[in-house]
């Protein structure tokens, strides 16, 4: 029962996490214009992985896609790659985990196969979550670097008569969605790996042996219970699980709103 709950919860948490990773990847607000001392702006800029947008206080919003591949910063390409790898691994992990769920019966699938699939999906979720967290963190680091560079420019370039309004960007909502979603996927993956231990069957199950003593007929079963949770003390009878299939993370090598005032 505990195994089924752990596995089911792991699946649900991972599902929410992957949905969040997909949402974060598609969101336009990865970086948003820093409003610092002016909470009201006539023109508000924000950027995503795929397009940049401008929202005027008139309510007019215009978004432009990044129609170049080679002209984009390598870091942005890397973030895109990490997020896509995370989504792909997560999606495969979800597919595998559906068949691995203890509450779902598919033909005469053995517990060992389900355990293998549970571990595989768990590892996939963990890698997926790590990819998302890494992608979001790389983007955040890029933002922090650019923020301080543009801040330095703001205070050094004020000597002339004509000033340039330097647009600084700060963390957008997508970053927080990505971090949370990546964390949830990671947690879900860990839960699946924990559940897998409980699904792993024993190598031997001793038959009940009857010992007949004179006058009494006592039957007892030494070690005759199944270590269903995998946490029992009868390690002698438990199958040592070798980890099953392993997945490789193929990381490919490879920005800006109040009634939108």
């Amino acid at each position: 029962m505990a195994v089924t709950a752990c596995q089911g919860l792991g699946f649900v948490v991972s599902l929410i996490g992957i949905a969040g990773i997909i949402a974060a990847t598609c969101m336009d607000q990865w970086s948003t214009q820093d409003l610092y001392n002016n909470p009201v702006t006539a023109v508000f800029n924000y950027q995503g992985l795929w397009r940049s947008c401008v929202r005027e206080s008139s309510g007019f919003t215009e978004c432009r896609g990044y129609f170049t591949l080679l002209g984009l910063p390598a870091m942005l390409q890397a973030v895109r790659a990490l997020m896509i790898v995370g989504i792909v691994l997560g999606a495969i992990g979800l597919l595998v985990s559906i068949f691995a769920l203890k509450c779902i019966r598919i033909g005469s699938m053995e517990d060992s196969a389900k355990a293998n699939m549970t571990l595989t999906s768990g590892i996939m979720f963990i890698v997926s979550g790590l990819c998302a967290i890494a992608g979001v963190s790389v983007f955040a680091n890029m933002l922090v670097t650019n923020f301080w560079m543009s801040t330095a420019n703001m205070y050094t370039g004020m000597g002339g008569m004509v000033q340039t309004v330097q647009t600084r960007y700060t963390f957008g909502a997508a970053l927080f969605v990505g971090w949370v979603a990546g964390g949830l996927t990671l947690i879900g993956g860990v839960m699946m790996c924990i559940a897998c231990r409980g699904l792993a069957p024993e190598e031997t199950n001793y038959k009940a042996v009857s010992y007949h003593a004179s006058g009494h007929s006592v039957a007892y079963k030494p070690g005759g219970f199944k270590a269903s949770t995998g946490f029992g003390s009868n390690t002698k009878n438990k199958k040592i699980y070798d980890g099953g299939a392993r997945t490789e993370d193929e990381v490919q090598s490879y920005p800006s709103k109040h009634d939108y005032v």
Partner: antibody, heavy 118, light 113 residues
Amino acid sequence: EVQLVQSGAEVKKPGASVKVSCKASGYTFTSYWMHWVKQRPGQRLEWIGMIHPNSGSTNYNEKFKGKATLTLDKSASTAYMELSSLRSEDTAVYYCARLKTGNSFDYWGQGTTVTVSS
Amino acid sequence: DIVLTQSPDSLAVSLGERATINCKSSQSLLNSGNQKNYLTWYQQKPGQPPKLLIYWASTRESGVPDRFSGSGSGTDFTLTISSLQAEDVAVYYCQNAYTYPFTFGQGTKLEIK
């Protein structure tokens, strides 16, 4: 047809207050910011502030904070601007204007002349 | 606040001739996000409210004759009337539409020579 109709001219004594109205018609009142602009004779236009008819949120030019108060009556599709503690320098034509794409004012009221005289 | 300075203060041009009004901003009005210049031009005739002519520095408002055109980027902008008509006699204002508070130029009075 979009129309912004303002209240008539006002003559006030120094220290008094005046409330100018701007009735909108021909468009969805709650969808556009309403701005107020001041024009003194022979001087440049001055932006006073703005109000969003949907939320009631306002933003004022620092220069007019404490001088102008922007309010609305959503049901009547009317925006109001109240000017307090009137002085001779408040003598001007006041316009309401609707904000559109490009943060430009596409429709203006006909203007309300406020004269402050003792 | 952004300061807009128009030149000249007044201008007399013959009918059918080209009229050029300049507007200089103390800060760049170019938004990097969409590469648009947030400068607007208005025409105001005596006793009337201003009328929108051009926004985004060069986009003509619908219904505005094509003899009116706007150009420029960053801090320097120009309003051009290619062939002056009698009805174009008015005061012309440029407006910063990029940052609050919105500010206007002092105006250029256009007359017929």
